[in-house]
Every structure is written in C-alpha cells, then in structure tokens.
C-alpha cells in the first residue's frame, strides 16, 4: 500500500564499472520523486539523492569505504509536492535493490596499454594502472592496489603481417615477451579477476601496434 | 553442476573433416575460456588452443599450422572444433576443457577421432 | 616456445610412500603452473594452480611448490588411489605446453 497515485520503484540494478557504481532504477516519475538509502547488511541506513526526479544515483562515495563489504539499497517514492506524505501503513513506498559486493561484482573497465619499448628480441608491454574512486590514506589507489595479484592481464599479441595471435599473462601490469626481429606487432590486453565467477573479464583494450606513436624501439 | 558434455566419437578417411562440439552448463559461459586439448594414443597431452567466447578471439598452437578451427555457439554455450584435412597422426581423444586463466579446473569426458582408410 | 621437462619418466613406489615429481620450464613462468592427474580412459583432473594452490576437493597429501623455472609436486603419502599419470601445464604464454607426463606405478 502506498500514498494515492505513488508508484513503487522497480528494475532496481547496480551499475559499476571500476567501483564507479550507480543505482538505477524505473519508471521515470509523474508526479512523484524519489531518496535512496544504502546500508551494509549490519550497518544503518544512509539517505542519499534527496526527493529527486532522476532515476538513478551515485553511490559510489558510499561503496568505496568499504569496498568488500555487502550493500542494499532501497529507493523511497514520495508525492511531488508533499514529500512529508506517506502510505496507509505510515512509511513511503519503497522497493529493495538486490544486494552488491563491489569488490566481487564491479565490472572490469576497459583496460589501456600505457606503453611498449622493444629492446632487441624482447618487447616490454605496460599496462596502465588505473585510478579507482576508493581511498585509503586519503589517497586514491588504483586498480591494482585494491585487488592485488587477484586482478591479471591477459595480452594478446600478433605479426602486423598476419593475423595468428599468441598471448601470455602477467599478476602485474608488465609483460616481457619475445618478438622476432625485423617484425612489427600489434598489441591488445583483458583485465581478468579468476577468482570470480561472473563478471570476470573487461573488454579488450584498443590495440596498439608497433611502428605508432606508442611505443619505443631500441635495438641492442 | 558445472559439466562439459562432448560429441561422441568418429571414424573419419584420410582429408576428410570432423566437427567435434562441447556443451558447457552450470556456468556463465562467455566467463571463461574454452581450451582443447588432445592426447594420441599412449601419448602425453597436447594443447591444440582456446577460444574466448566474450569476444571470440582465439588462439592455436602455431605448430599445428592450421589443423583446428575453434568457434563457439553462445546461444547453446557450445563450443566446437573443427580438424581438417585429416591424417592418421590426429587419431587421438580430444578433450575441451574450462579456462579458469590459471588452470583448466573442469574438462569434458573426450571424443575419440580415428582417421583410418 | 616454453618446453616443460617433466622427471621421472615413471617411478615406482608403495602405499604409504612419500613421492616428488619435478617440472623444469624452459624460460621463467612465475607462478603459471598446473598439475593434473590422470587415470586410464578418463579425463585428466586438475589437482594444483598456480604452482601451489590446491584445488577444491582435493586432498590434501597433495603439494606443489617452487616459481620461476623450477617446480616439484610431491604426494606425502600414496594412497592406492594415487596410482595414476601425473602432468605439469604452464599457462603462462601460449602455447599452453604440458610435460611429458610421469606414471607412478606400484611397486
């Protein structure tokens, strides 16, 4: 039961990308608005995009304080114009999210080669280390710092000459790989978290190849 | 449960093409890697490749110079290879196993490919 | 390519033995490395990742140790079921090479 021509949300899903994380929610509102509350399973409830008419919110502040933690969500509905109005049973209408454990469910964003410097028959690829919302310190950290060697790149490398790829993994952000001489390669990696079993792959990175403003050859 | 579930076996005549498929269940599908892995009889194993079903790319043992072709069904999450221009040296069993990046955890039961004139 | 020298070839040992096998890599994988153990006519069965991690449900008088170049697997104690082909596979760059397989037998 709810106030008169209130209608409770529903859809309610987490969108996250590198903890960047977001609750969005339907339908778009007539004649009502909406607060959403987040909390961990033992914590209090944490009222955040107060009365408003989007249909999603940033809850990205909250998450990253504890970013292995399990958070719900709920989004209230409320009478445009008479937020103080609540339904027969003396509450709002609300609906509960599903429940979201960043650190197991936030997806991989799309990993970036920062680098790659040839020195005779040996190319070192680097991968950049992207920054996270999450702090500790009151610094940011980046990707690796929050998961360790549980995050791996997986890169995938091939001739500019033909299309074979081999590919080789690293629990850091370098790769040094053998290369033939005389021979431009193309580059392109995936952020991995194995210990996971969904959401466990980003996207590939763009690729990059050798011969392009990249790289760094050095002949030894 | 989390099962590969292959094809069964095959009698094939020397050039001729076989077609032996995977079926995973129990898991997301397009999370892991499909690797194949075959073994001659009496042999050790021998790893031919793998296919990516999130995007699709593959990679093979150069050294097999073209012998398999790795694709994948994500709808039926099934995963195939296809052996061509068969001799008698690919009589093996060949098993497709899941990819967990640092081991291969879960394989199928293996098809047995007989190349015999 | 990475080649994988796997030793013994076979051995033979008794129930209550304690055995080592060893894998030697070509060129530095880290940690990369897996064991799997396989019985006659069926799949092979993943036994350690990442050179020492022991995978779920398997017992524990399993063990891998060592980085780099250099790995060992060692069963404490052989159990009758424990008579089967073991294999190395480093997954560290393609392609995925395994050893050539040692095969404890009984004694």
């Known amino acids: 039961s709810g106030t008169t021509n209130t209608v409770a949300a529903y859809n309610l899903t987490w969108k996250s990308t590198n903890f960047k994380t977001i609750l969005e929610w339907e339908p778009k509102p007539v004649n009502q608005v909406y607060t959403v509350q987040i909390s961990t399973k033992s914590g209090d409830w944490k009222s955040k995009c107060f009365y408003t008419t989007d249909t999603e919110c940033d809850l990205t502040d909250e998450i990253v304080k504890d970013v292995k933690q399990t958070y719900l969500a709920r989004v209230f509905s409320y009478p445009a114009g008479n937020v103080e109005s609540t339904g027969s049973a003396g509450e709002p209408l609300y609906e509960n999210s599903p429940e979201f454990t960043p650190y197991l469910e936030t997806n991989l964003g799309q990993p970036t080669i920062q680098s790659f410097e040839q020195v005779g028959t040996k190319v070192n690829v680097t991968v950049e280390d992207e920054r996270t919302l999450v702090r500790r310190n009151n610094t940011f950290l980046s990707l690796r710092d929050v998961f360790g060697k549980d995050l791996i790149y997986t890169l995938y490398y091939w001739k500019s000459s033909s299309s074979g790829k081999k590919t080789a993994k690293t629990n850091t952000n370098e790769f040094l790989i053998d290369v033939d001489k005389g021979e431009n390669y193309c580059f392109s990696v995936q952020a991995v978290i194995p210990s996971r079993t969904v959401n466990r792959k980003s996207t590939d990175s763009p690729v990059e190849c050798m011969g392009q403003e990249k790289g760094e050859f050095r002949e030894i | 449960q989390i099962q590969l579930v292959q094809s069964g076996g095959e009698v094939k005549k020397p050039g001729a093409s076989v077609r032996v498929s995977c079926k995973a269940s129990?898991?997301?599908?397009?999370?892991?890697?499909v690797y194949w892995v075959r073994q001659s009889p009496g042999k050790g194993l021998e790893w031919i490749g793998y296919i990516d079903p999130y995007n699709g790319i593959t990679i093979y043992d150069q050294n097999l110079k073209g012998k398999a072709t790795l694709t994948v069904d994500k709808s039926t999450s099934t995963a195939y290879m296809e052996l061509s221009s068969l001799r008698s040296e690919d009589t093996a069993v060949y098993f497709c196993?899941?990819?967990?990046?640092?081991?291969?955890?879960?394989w199928g039961q293996g098809t047995t490919v007989t190349v015999s004139s | 390519d990475i080649q994988m020298t796997q030793s013994p070839a076979s051995l033979s040992a008794s129930v209550g033995d304690r055995v080592t096998i060893t894998c030697l890599a070509s060129q530095t994988i880290d940690t990369w490395l897996a064991w799997y153990l396989q019985k006659p006519g069926k799949s092979p069965q993943l036994l350690i990742y990442a050179a020492t991690n022991l995978a779920d449900g398997v017992p524990s008088r399993f063990s891998g140790s060592g980085s780099g170049t250099d790995f060992s697997f060692t069963i404490s104690s052989l159990q009758p079921e424990d008579f089967a082909t073991y294999y190395c596979?480093?997954?560290?760059?393609?392609?995925?090479?395994f050893g050539q397989g040692t095969k404890l037998e009984i004694k």
């Open positions: 129990g898991y997301s599908f397009t999370d892991y890697n």
């Open positions: 196993a899941r990819d967990v990046t640092t081991a291969l955890d879960f």
């Open positions: 596979q480093q997954v560290y760059s393609s392609p995925f090479t």
